[in-house]
């Protein structure tokens, strides 16, 4: 087909220590020679679809997918990944080819998949398909650790069935709440699989290998804590092991602990007890409830009782498949230039999610915090007051979730102007979107008060840059205004900004900023 553009698809691998990567996602520095990905026309597909050779990437590697388009005129484009659209800014190289880039920083499982690039040129529309996968994903795995009781010993073994074999460590903490964060001095780490000291406040086991780090907390009910207003909830998938620890401290040994499931005592062999005297001669007892492989009928209220403490319960829910529950409706926010603001997503999920925040094709680390009501929250505050589209993406073994946010920054318009032989155009990105006026400056109107209404064409939001709308106004040149100074003004509720343009014969156009 004569009309089809000449397309070249390339892969650029960035060295990991390349400080240039990510500084500008539109124009990444080339670290190594680009690898040609072919981009052949896909036969028997509806529409024009080019398919690049499959791309295999190491975990944590940084790459750029790049398309070079040899087609006349302007092009516009859109990237789509996992049903999320990411806007793209084409630019032109020295050979006047359109260049479209997608930077993927520190490749993770989340970023693997099909990247679709839709390009619209003056002549035709076409689609380019990239398939990106992680090298060795079939060989490498990292599974969440789980617990087993050590045969004939009061100890727990931590197991993570991962490849390559992970380093397993216990993370122990004996204080409450915030002071049990990983970096805290109250936290003790033991790089071993077996743990005998099971009386601590907070016990976690973590496994790490090349793919990262996964942790599992030993679910605990502490009868010395005031009963919560919301029952703690524990989710497990069918076949996973259940471990709940009940802990109580009393002035002497004259108390016992019991576990019940829905008011029935747990069967012999599904619990074991340990006790010790603490330094101040009080007695600590712990009672473990465990099921080596849970079934649906293990769902219910597990209650730990003591004759000397208020009883407490946890709701254990056994599910067939993991889930992520959250509202996925997109949210728009409008803030002032110096207003403190964070995006936040509240969700309930099992197993624990991996997540990222993305803005303008850059991914940012995602932190999660557990709330008392069984929900978790992830916040993103590092937007640096840049308007646009922000994406929260979360996934676990069984589910995926994406939520879009738009951030608008209230500010006075700033005007940029450009002119050609036949027209003058002004652009502004102020918010709320500005309205436009054009004025003619002449002997009769030295203050440029004579309004121009003929030949003006306003376009609201004609190009969307990462979700940031830009407004433009174009004045078609007529004999009546040739050779005159004209002034375009953009105004919104926060103020007005103007630019003065001399409409002379073709050539360089002087612009005068006038605020």
């Amino acid at each position: 087909n004569q009309d089809l553009p000449v397309i070249k698809c390339v892969l650029i691998n960035h060295k990991n220590n390349d400080s240039s990567v990510g500084k500008s996602s539109s124009y990444p520095m080339v670290s190594e020679s680009p690898e040609d990905l072919g981009c052949a026309l896909r036969p028997q597909s509806s529409g024009t679809v080019y398919e690049a050779a499959a791309v295999e990437v190491d975990v944590s590697a940084s790459i750029t997918l790049q398309v070079l388009v040899d087609a006349p005129g302007n092009i516009s484009c859109l990237w789509v990944f996992k049903h999320s659209s990411l806007n793209c800014q084409p630019h032109f190289d020295l050979q006047n080819r359109g260049v479209v880039s997608m930077v993927i920083l520190k490749m993770t499982e989340t970023q693997a998949g099909e990247y679709l690039l839709f390009i619209q040129s003056e002549a035709t529309n076409y689609t380019i398909l990239f398939t990106v996968s992680i090298r060795n994903t079939l060989l490498y795995t990292l599974r969440r650790p789980y617990f087993r009781k050590m045969e004939n010993q009061d100890a727990l073994v931590c197991i993570s069935e991962s490849v390559p074999e992970p380093i397993v460590e216990w993370v122990l903490c004996d204080s409450q709440g915030e002071s049990c964060k990983e970096e805290s001095p109250a936290v003790v780490k033991k790089e071993e699989k077996v743990l005998h000291e099971l009386f601590g406040t907070d016990i976690r086991c973590c496994a790490r290998n090349e793919l990262g780090r996964e942790c599992t907390r030993l679910f605990t009910i502490d009868l010395n804590q005031t009963p919560q207003t919301t029952l703690p909830q524990l989710f497990l998938k069918v076949g996973e092991p259940l471990w709940i620890r009940c802990k109580a401290v009393h002035v002497n040994h004259g108390f016992g602990l019991t576990w019940e499931l829905e008011n029935k005592a747990l069967e012999e062999g599904n619990y074991f007890e340990m006790s010790t005297y603490s330094t101040n001669r009080t007695m600590i007892r712990i009672l473990f409830a465990f099921v080596s492989s849970v079934a649906r009928n293990d769902t219910g209220y597990y209650t730990c009782s003591s004759s000397k403490h208020p009883s407490q319960s946890a709701l254990v829910t056994i599910v067939e498949k993991g889930f992520i529950n959250a509202t996925n409706s997109s949210e728009d926010y409008e803030i002032d230039q110096y207003e403190e603001f964070c995006f936040s997503v509240r969700f309930k999920a099992y197993p624990q999610i991996r997540c990222t925040w993305t803005f303008s094709r850059k991914s940012f680390p995602c932190e999660q915090k557990g709330l008392d009501n069984g929900y978790s929250i992830s916040k993103f505050c590092n937007h640096k007051h840049q308007p646009g589209e922000y994406i929260f993406h979360a996934e676990n073994d069984d589910a995926q979730f994406t939520k879009m946010f738009t951030l608008n920054i209230r500010r006075k318009p700033q005007v940029l102007a450009e002119a050609s032989a036949s027209q003058a155009s002004c652009f502004s990105d102020g918010y709320p979107l500005p309205s436009w006026t054009w004025k003619k400056c002449s002997d009769k109107s030295p203050n440029c008060t004579e309004e121009i209404t003929e030949g003006v064409w306003n376009r609201k939001a004609n190009r969307k840059v990462f979700g940031q709308w830009v407004s433009s106004s174009t004045l078609n040149m007529s004999e009546a205004i040739k050779g005159f100074l004209v002034k375009c003004c953009a105004y919104n509720s926060l103020g007005t900004s103007c630019e003065t343009i001399l409409l002379n014969s073709p050539g360089p156009f002087p612009f005068i900023q006038d605020n």
């Epitope: 008011n263 209220y301 009782s305 208020p310 009883s311 319960s313 709701l315």
Partner: nanobody, 111 residues
Framework: QVQLQESGGGLVQAGGSLRLSCAAS????????IDWYRQAPGKQREWVAQ???????HYEPSLKGRFTISRDNAKNTAYLQMNSLKPEDTAVYYC?????WGQGTQVTVSS
């Protein structure tokens, strides 16, 4: 499904007494423990007392001696007897079984 309904709240002078009731529907009443909580205006909900299925009682330490929790399994009802009431006892009082809650009953203690 358990349904709970509190009653017995009202306006009382400081130093006076009130007896709150928590009536439950559902066959598991006798097998479950019952907690009373309260929530004063603008404050977090706080635990008050508990009675276990075996009749053992536990209290928020600052309330022990003034408040008494009891239950009548035949009537599927739990009670909270409150004596020597103080203005700071003004709150909505709720009973709870597992994660089922009642609607609450208002207790107002005037000075």
């Amino acid at each position: 499904q358990v349904q709970l309904q509190e009653s017995g709240g009202g306006l009382v002078q400081a130093g006076g007494s009130l007896r709150l009731s928590c009536a439950a529907s559902g066959s598991t009443f006798s097998k479950n423990y019952i907690d009373w909580y309260r929530q004063a205006p603008g404050k977090q909900r706080e635990w008050v007392a508990q009675i276990t299925s075996g009749g053992n009682t536990h209290y928020e330490p600052s309330l022990k001696g003034r408040f008494t929790i009891s239950r009548d399994n035949a009537k599927n009802t739990a009670y909270l007897q409150m004596n020597s009431l103080k203005p700071e006892d003004t709150a909505v009082y709720y009973c709870r079984i597992l994660d089922y809650w009642g609607q609450g009953t208002q207790v107002t203690v005037s000075s």
